[in-house]
């Protein structure tokens, strides 16, 4: 008799999820000498333990604590780049500017990037058919709680000037409901962070507007200022040129506004 299975609104667990997590862990620890001590089998066991046999709408940050402990990593606190709705460019930037880090450049972020996972209450099975959608089903699902947990810890670790890349092509350049707006902004530590520096990335070739004056950016500035952190903002009109100049600041095209 086939068991009844809960149908969720979101896509199911990414295929070959256990193998992918384990392979990513091995690759990361090989590339990053400071993480060579990490036992990837233990990491997978802790990851699995956070959601297997648990109701996928009832996951807590506490469930991920064993994984957080195993994945503890020190990144230079003044070299943190946050991003919102512009992940690809942020990652391209840190691939060039190797001393800066997005969350996905850390072990735990790297393991989970672009993956989906969930289990089922009272069975050891991974659900490859469907997983809860944050909006349509529940917010306390395994993926959302994971990213909330690691994002909070990442923001708490930041110091000096914290950089954030924002998508100037979106209707809400700063979105209070994004992970950046709902988690990271509120977990920057004013006693450690002097300034939040926003880089607003323009999408259109001929877009010369000052998007730092956008109402949502002003809202971000207000939230940050109330937390006793300074705020600054810079338009990046030509993201392609920006990346080129990060690679090679000597290039003659880097003399003008980017």
């Amino acid at each position: 008799v086939p068991r009844w299975r809960q149908q969720w609104s979101g896509p199911g667990t990414t295929k070959r999820f256990p193998e992918t997590v384990l392979a990513r862990c091995v690759k990361y620890t090989e590339i990053h000498p400071e993480m060579r001590h990490v036992d990837c089998q233990s990491v997978w066991d802790a990851f699995k333990g956070a959601f297997i046999s648990k109701h996928p709408c009832n996951i807590t940050e506490e469930d991920y604590q064993p994984l957080m402990k195993l994945g503890t990593q020190t990144v230079p606190c003044n070299k943190i780049l946050l991003w919102s709705r512009i992940k690809d460019l942020a990652h391209q930037f840190t691939q060039v500017q190797r001393d800066m880090f997005t969350l996905e450049d850390t072990l735990l972020g790297y393991l989970a990037d672009d993956l989906t996972w969930c289990g089922e209450f009272n069975t050891s099975k991974i659900n490859y058919q469907s997983c809860p959608d944050w909006r349509k089903d529940c917010s306390n699902n395994p993926v959302s709680v994971f990213w909330k947990t690691v994002s909070r810890r990442f923001a708490e670790a930041a110091c000096d000037v914290v950089h954030v890349m924002l998508n100037g092509s979106r209707s809400k350049i700063f979105d209070k409901n994004s992970t950046f707006g709902s988690v990271e902004v509120h977990n920057l530590q004013p006693e450690k962070v002097q300034t939040l520096e926003a880089w607003v990335i323009h999408g259109g070739r001929e877009d010369s507007r000052d998007l730092c004056q956008d109402p949502t950016i002003k809202e971000l500035e207000s939230i940050i200022s109330k937390r006793n952190i300074q705020f600054s903002c810079k338009n990046i009109y030509r993201p392609d040129k920006f990346l080129q100049c990060v690679k090679n600041p000597e290039d003659s095209s880097c003399t003008s506004e980017i």
Epitope: S232, K234, E257
Partner: nanobody, 122 residues
Framework: QVQLQESGGRLVQPGGSLRLSCAAS????????MAWFRQGPGKEREFVAS???????LYADFVKGRFTISRDNAKNTVYLQMDSLKPEDTTVYYC????????????????WGQGTQVTVSS
């Protein structure tokens, strides 16, 4: 290539003020983070303040509330306003530049000026 030239250093009394300037040539400063460092004889180069391409500032704890870094991109110049000067501020002050982001580590700056001497004494 960015060339940097500091000026404004001189003898000043304790409690007095001074404004250092750093003029850049060869590049527009608008894409560059600029910083001031200082170094006494036989000592390590020490971070004082920085201002990024987006004008966010960073200060060493020992100058917070006394020194202010600012920039004028039109004049291709960065300034360090030094108030409430103390005898221990006596040393050579250097201007430095790196693309985009201001940081504290001197090794991360590609371009340096020759320095300007500040002496605080009565």
């Amino acid at each position: 290539q960015v060339q940097l030239q500091e000026s404004g250093g001189r003898l000043v009394q304790p409690g007095g003020s001074l404004r250092l300037s750093c003029a850049a040539s060869g590049r527009t400063l608008s894409n560059y983070a600029m910083a001031w460092f200082r170094q006494g004889p036989g000592k390590e180069r020490e971070f004082v303040a920085s201002i990024s391409a987006s004008d966010s500032t960073l200060y060493a704890d020992f100058v917070k509330g006394r020194f202010t870094i600012s920039r004028d991109n039109a004049k291709n110049t960065v300034y360090l306003q030094m108030d409430s000067l103390k005898p221990e501020d006596t040393t050579v002050y250097y201007c430095a530049a790196r693309f985009w982001i201001g940081v504290r580590a001197p090794a991360e700056y590609n371009y340096w000026g020759q320095g300007t001497q500040v002496t605080v004494s009565s």
